[in-house]
Each structure stands twice: as C-alpha cells, then as structure tokens.
Interface confidence: low
C-alpha cells in the first residue's frame, strides 16, 4: 500500500519503540471557535510532545462519528455527513454549510502506539447571521459607490503626499507593508513542522492499494465508501514509512 505508508513527521512523530512509556503527548486544538450559519469552519488538532506513532485519528461530535483519517484505509467520512464534511487540511476536518444544530463539542481522538489514545476538544458555536448582515445585500450598491469615492480621494491624497516625500521614505513604507503582510500570514493556525509529507498527503487519484488487483464495481464502491474523490483538496492519510 504505497499511498499510506509515510510517517507523520509533520506532527513531530517518528516510529515508536515497542516499550510503552508514560503518555507525554499533548493535544493542541483550535479551542472554542465560532462561525456563521451557512459558512464553513476548519477543526484542527495537533499532537505534540510524544514520539508515539499515530495509527488513526477519529473526529467525533458528541457520540457521533464524523470522519476517520486512518493510516491504512485512508479517509472515511460518515455517510450522514458526507455532503457537508471535507477531509483536511492535514489531519483536520472542514465543516461546510453550517447550521445552528452544528453547535456543540467536537473531539479529535488520536490512536497512537504505544501511548494509547489522546483526545482533544473543540467547542463550536454556530451563530445566526445578524439582521444587519441580511440587510447588507441591499446596501451593496450604495456602499460600493461610497467606497469608490473614498478610493479616488485617498488615491489623490496619496499621490500628492508621495510626490512630496523623498525616495527614502517610500522605501520605508514598502518594508513596513511587507512586514505587516508577513505577520498577518503568521496568525493562521499551522502545524509546528513542515506539512509536505504531513499525515494526510494530497492526492489527485484514488489509492490503488485498497483494491490492488481488484477491478469493477466493488473497487468503485470501495473508493466511494472511503470518500476518496479525484480532486486535489482531498488527501489520503499517510502514516507509516514505506518499506517496499
């Protein structure tokens, strides 16, 4: 099974020794988060401070299974959530078309060897879109006109100011702008290590390993069952080092 035999070193993990020790790992999560009804949200967990080998990550809502990222069998999305849940990024889970009923606790459950099970908790609150936001669609033409006017005025001011400044000052502004862009980018949640072979590798095609020589309907059903579709954003879980 070539597609699923990579270590999750993006999670800071390596092949664990067989001797079982203390459970030293910790789960970092996105914590308490909120999102608007109809929108989407990314649930993220990150296991750190352990050398344990991750064999599977379950995503659950209360006692209901949402999805599984499994080392050997790839992603599995629970049929009842198939239309609204997308795997990734990484070991995370994307919830789409949120409803108020999606409010509640979500758990990431890491099955590891030899440590056992680690669980992280995320509380999601789905907010009703406000009346002001509903009314915004009628205000768009007016706001657009106002914004255009402001842009013209600001542009004129900037041109005038720019012409009166020295080139040195211009360079400083440029550097400051670049720094602001970089710091804004760093606010996004990201794993502590590079993602390239990161546990769920991006893949365009369905994994051959699950079906091997098998062809036909069963193979297609299998791919469908594990929700392995042919587009880039959906990854395969890849946990173990390939040995041939």
């Amino acid at each position: 099974m070539r597609w699923c035999l990579l270590l999750i070193w993006a999670q800071g993990l390596r092949q664990a020794p067989l001797a079982s020790g203390m459970m030293t790992g910790t789960i970092e999560t996105t914590g308490n988060i909120s999102a608007e009804k109809g929108g989407s949200i990314i649930l993220q967990c990150h296991l750190s401070s352990t050398t344990a080998q991750v064999t599977q990550v379950n995503w659950e809502q209360q006692d209901q299974l949402l999805a599984i990222c499994n080392a050997d069998l790839g992603w599995h999305i629970s049929p009842s959530f198939k239309d609204r849940v997308a795997p990734g990024p990484g070991l995370g889970l994307t919830l789409q078309s949120l409803t108020v009923n999606d409010t509640g606790e979500y758990f990431c459950i890491y099955h590891t060897y030899p440590d056992g099970t680690y669980t992280g908790r995320i509380f999601l609150e789905v907010l009703e879109s406000s009346v002001a936001e509903h009314g915004a669609r009628f205000q768009i033409p007016l706001l657009g006109a106002m914004a255009a006017t402001l842009v013209v005025i600001c542009t004129a001011v900037i041109v005038v100011v720019a012409l009166t400044r020295k080139k040195k000052a211009l360079r400083i502004h440029s550097v400051e702008g670049d720094l602001r862009r970089k710091s804004a980018g760093q606010e996004e949640w990201s794993p502590s290590a590079p993602s390239p072979p990161g546990s769920c590798v991006q893949a365009e095609a369905a994994p051959a390993g699950l079906c091997g020589e098998q062809r036909g309907e069963d193979c297609a059903e299998l791919h469908d069952y594990f929700n392995v579709l042919s587009y880039r954003s959906l990854g395969n879980c890849s946990f173990f080092t390939e040995t041939g």
Partner: antibody, heavy 119, light 107 residues
C-alpha cells in the same frame, strides 16, 4: 445487548446455492458494517466479504464470482448467497460486526451456522 | 493478499506461565493487526485491536505489541480458561486475512 444470529440450511447439495440470513439486534445496520467469515472443520478463519453501512460491498477476490451480500436495514438482516457450492465449502459460517471505528477488528460474532455440502 | 504466519502451531504451557504468540506479516502493515481467541466449539472473541489496544471485558493479562511485520500476543499468567486457538487478523488491505492460528494447550 449486541447480538448476531445466523440461520442457514445446514445441508446443501454440490453445485447448489447457499443462502444464509444474519439477524442482528442491539445496534443498527446503518451504523455498523457486517462481514462474513467462514471456518472449515479443523481449519482457520477465512474472510468472505463485507457489506458497509451504505450498502456497498467488498468481496474476497477468491469468492467474487459466486458470492453476493445484501441487507435489509429495516429488518436488521444481512444475507449471504453463494453459488456453485462444492464439498470444500463445508464450514461454519459466521456473520460478524465490523466497522471503520474499530478498523475492521471484528468486535461481535454470531454463534455461526454449520453448512455441509454433500450429496 | 497479505499473508500472516503464526508460530508455533502448538504451544504447551503450565498454568501461571507467561506465553507469547507470534504473528508475522508478509509486508509492513503498521499496527493493523487484531487478535482473537476461539475456545473449542465457540465463536472467536476479539482480544486486542490495533496490535496493542485492549478490549473492554478482556482480562488484563492479555497484551499485544509489535509494529510493521512482527507482532506478539502475550498472556502474562496463563489460566486454564485460556486454553484455546489464537488467531491474528490484518486490516491493512483487502482482502482481510487471518493467520492459521496457534493452539494453546496445557502440559
């Protein structure tokens, strides 16, 4: 309480078909997959195939041409049909609960139904 | 198909002894191995999943270890009720396969 119970014909003539029904209780077939496993007398276990919660199936390639698994969720029943039986198909046939949650570890087994292929 | 080789075929032990069952896979299967006990005329019973994870209701004397291709089921102090056949099963890829089993008997 989780239970699985197989019911079969007991005796089947060579070249005939085998039909076994597995009736489950204590859980829903929309939440758990069911695998079929058989065990010839004095021998080991052999996985035949699985039917998933959504009704999709995957069969052991050794049996694909003559095996069919289906189910009726409302009746909590799973059906195995195997065609063209030969004497070496004599075995105890088990229906087993298996799921992605336990990564196809078979956590509950039926008591098995004995099938003898003989004329 | 992934071949699982169990050894030895028969293990003879005395009550109270520690015993280990071996299961070797024909290729790397991570920790996708499960262990079952089957007493005479009974159905198999799941003992260990994922190579090492315990199952509710199974005595703590049963433990599992291993990763990759070599796996071990251990009973740290055999009791007479443990006399049975023991099977390993892989769920790394289709078809799911079982080892041929190891018979545990009393000396």
């Amino acid at each position: 309480q989780v239970q699985l119970k197989e019911s079969g014909p007991g005796l089947v003539a060579p070249s005939q078909s085998l039909s076994i029904t597995c009736t489950v209780s204590g859980f829903s077939l929309t939440s758990y997959d069911i695998s079929w496993i058989r065990q010839p007398p004095g021998k080991g276990l052999e996985w035949l195939g699985v039917i998933w919660t959504g009704g999709g199936t995957n069969y052991n390639s050794a049996f694909m041409s003559r095996l069919s698994i289906s189910k009726d969720n409302s009746k909590s029943q799973v059906f195995l049909k195997m065609n063209s039986l030969q004497t070496d198909d004599t075995a105890i046939y088990y229906c087993v609960r298996s799921t992605m949650i336990t990564h196809y570890a078979m956590d509950y087994w039926g008591q098995g139904t004995s099938v003898t292929v003989s004329s | 198909d992934i071949l699982l080789t169990q050894s030895p075929a028969i293990l003879s032990v005395s009550p109270g002894e520690r015993v280990s069952f071996s299961c070797r896979a024909s290729q790397n299967i991570g920790t996708s191995i499960h262990w079952y006990q089957q007493r005479t005329n009974g159905s198999p019973r799941l003992l260990i999943k994922y190579a090492f994870e315990s199952i509710s209701g199974i005595p703590s004397r049963f433990s599992g270890s291993g990763s990759g291709t070599d796996f071990t089921l251990s009973i740290n102090s055999v009791e007479s009720e443990d006399i049975a056949d023991y099977y390993c099963q892989q769920s790394n890829s289709w078809p799911l396969t079982f080892g041929a089993g190891t018979k545990l008997e009393l000396k």
